[in-house]
């Protein structure tokens, strides 16, 4: 139904990493424009991305107000140049998105190894606590702030001279591991939320190896 020259949006998809959240859809518009609305289950609809020819809408500002809420979005289609025109039912065509709960579903961004320091046969590896777009008291919260005890990191490490990997886990942003004296090691980390059923793990961080700038070696 609807006017002859508008089609409803389809394939509405949430793309979200570290709470940066964009709704995408199809098709590319031909003689039509879109407006997006977002709501919590119990809240009012709020309009965003008015009469756009884009097929995406950044909804980050809305979802970061409460990342534990469940959100629903819908995309309205209007004829280009005649946005007052409606479908046969008296309202514009629209399509609903899947429900989205940011806290449970946002992808974990690729972590970064901030530093590593060797003291004798111990190495301390520190993961950068990445800033999110979630705010409290006008301050942007870090990933650790937001996820707290739900977030762990897994460290993969191996001797530069071999391929056998070892793993360690931490519920902070730091690892303290034992290494063999005189050996160089390489490191990669991964963020994990074990309690999730989807998007449990980030991609691995870039590999950092001892003997490069990022680390510090102290013979004790």
């Amino acid at each position: 139904s609807g006017t002859t020259n508008t089609v409803a949006a389809y394939n509405l998809t949430w793309k979200s990493t570290n709470f940066k959240t964009i709704l995408e859809w199809e098709p590319k518009p031909v003689n039509q424009v879109y407006t997006v609305q977002i709501s919590t289950k119990s809240g009012d609809w709020k309009s965003k991305c008015f009469y756009t020819t884009d097929t995406e809408c950044d909804l980050t500002d809305e979802i970061v107000k409460d990342v534990k809420q469940t959100y629903l979005a819908r995309v309205f289609s209007y004829p280009a140049g005649n946005v007052e025109s409606t479908g046969s039912a008296g309202e514009p065509l629209y399509e609903n998105s899947p429900e989205f709960t940011p806290y449970l579903e946002t992808n974990l961004g690729q972590p970064t190894i901030q530093s590593f320091e060797q003291v004798g046969t111990k190495v301390n590896v520190t993961v950068e606590d990445e800033r999110t777009l979630v705010r409290r008291n006008n301050t942007f919260l870090s990933l650790r702030d937001v996820f707290g005890k739900d977030l762990i990191y897994t460290l993969y490490y191996w001797k530069s001279s071999s391929s056998g990997k070892k793993t360690a886990k931490t519920n902070t942003n730091e690892f303290l591991i034992d290494v063999d004296k005189g050996e160089n090691y390489c490191f990669s980390v991964q963020a994990v939320i074990p309690s999730r059923t989807v998007n449990r793990k980030s991609t691995d961080s870039p590999v950092e190896c001892m003997g490069q700038e990022k680390g510090e070696f102290r013979e004790i």
Epitope: T101, G148, K149
Partner: antibody, heavy 121, light 109 residues
Framework: QVQLQESGAEVKKPGASVKVSCKAS????????IEWVRQAPGQGLEWMGE????????KYNEKFKGRVTMTRDTSTSTVYMELSSLRSEDTAVYYC??????????????WGQGTLVTVSS | QAVVTQEPSLTVSPGGSVTLTCRSS?????????ANWVQQKPGQTPTSLIS???NRGPWTPARFSGSILGDKAVLTLWGAHAEDEADYFC?????????FGGGTKLTVL
């Protein structure tokens, strides 16, 4: 407003099981851990375990492993705690609790009214 | 399993200040232990004062504050009221489980 409504008092015989319910309302049920804490008469608080309703992920106190099971029913926003092989020392008030979320923070902010479970032959 | 230790009892004068401590048998308490402080008055359900080390609930009176001091979590009460007489429990998170302390009985006298 957040509310946690627990089921009524129970009297059980040693060796039996008890299933206590905690019905949540006023928030997004799936996103918050529900903690179970018990308090024996005249004693302190003891953590039993937790469940995240969205994924049914659970963590249990080692002391109760094998005896405690936590489940949830998302259609009714209710969490259940079942304790089996009851003994007299399980006589306690059983509480469910939920954290207050500020963008971060974890713990025991909102509490149910408690369910008294009495184990007696 | 870790043991969490609190002072069994403390006394404070009305209008006075007092610090309750929460120690961990495994070493220093850090922000990763997400210290919680819970108040319980006789015959009542527990109520939260502090979660996540230092976050007050909107219902928590401003005279209560949580922090880490040295190697332990502390709850400071500034300007005690008669109604603050209660048991106070701390709880610490250890990677995959919570542990409660034995509680501190605070008397306002």
């Amino acid at each position: 407003q957040v509310q946690l409504q627990e089921s009524g008092a129970e009297v059980k015989k040693p060796g039996a099981s008890v299933k206590v319910s905690c019905k949540a309302s006023g928030y997004t049920f799936s996103s918050y851990w529900i903690e179970w804490v018990r308090q024996a008469p005249g004693q302190g608080l003891e953590w039993m375990g937790e469940i995240l309703p969205g994924s049914a992920s659970t963590k249990y106190n080692e002391k109760f492993k094998g005896r405690v099971t936590m489940t949830r029913d998302t259609s009714t926003s209710t969490v259940y705690m079942e304790l089996s092989s009851l003994r007299s020392e399980d006589t306690a008030v059983y509480y469910c609790a939920r954290d207050y979320y500020y963008g971060s923070s974890y713990g025991f902010a909102y509490w149910g009214q408690g369910t008294l479970v009495t184990v007696s032959s | 399993q870790a043991v969490v230790t609190q002072e069994p009892s403390l006394t404070v004068s009305p209008g006075g200040s007092v610090t309750l401590t929460c120690r961990s048998s495994t070493g220093a308490v850090t922000t990763s232990n997400y210290a919680n402080w819970v108040q319980q008055k006789p015959g009542q359900t527990p109520t939260s004062l502090i979660s996540g080390t230092n976050n007050r609930g909107p219902w928590t009176p401003a005279r209560f504050s949580g922090s880490i001091l040295g190697d332990k979590a502390v709850l400071t009460l500034w300007g005690a009221h008669a109604e603050d007489e209660a048991d106070y429990f701390c709880a610490l998170w250890y990677s995959n489980h919570w542990v409660f302390g034995g509680g501190t009985k605070l008397t306002v006298l």
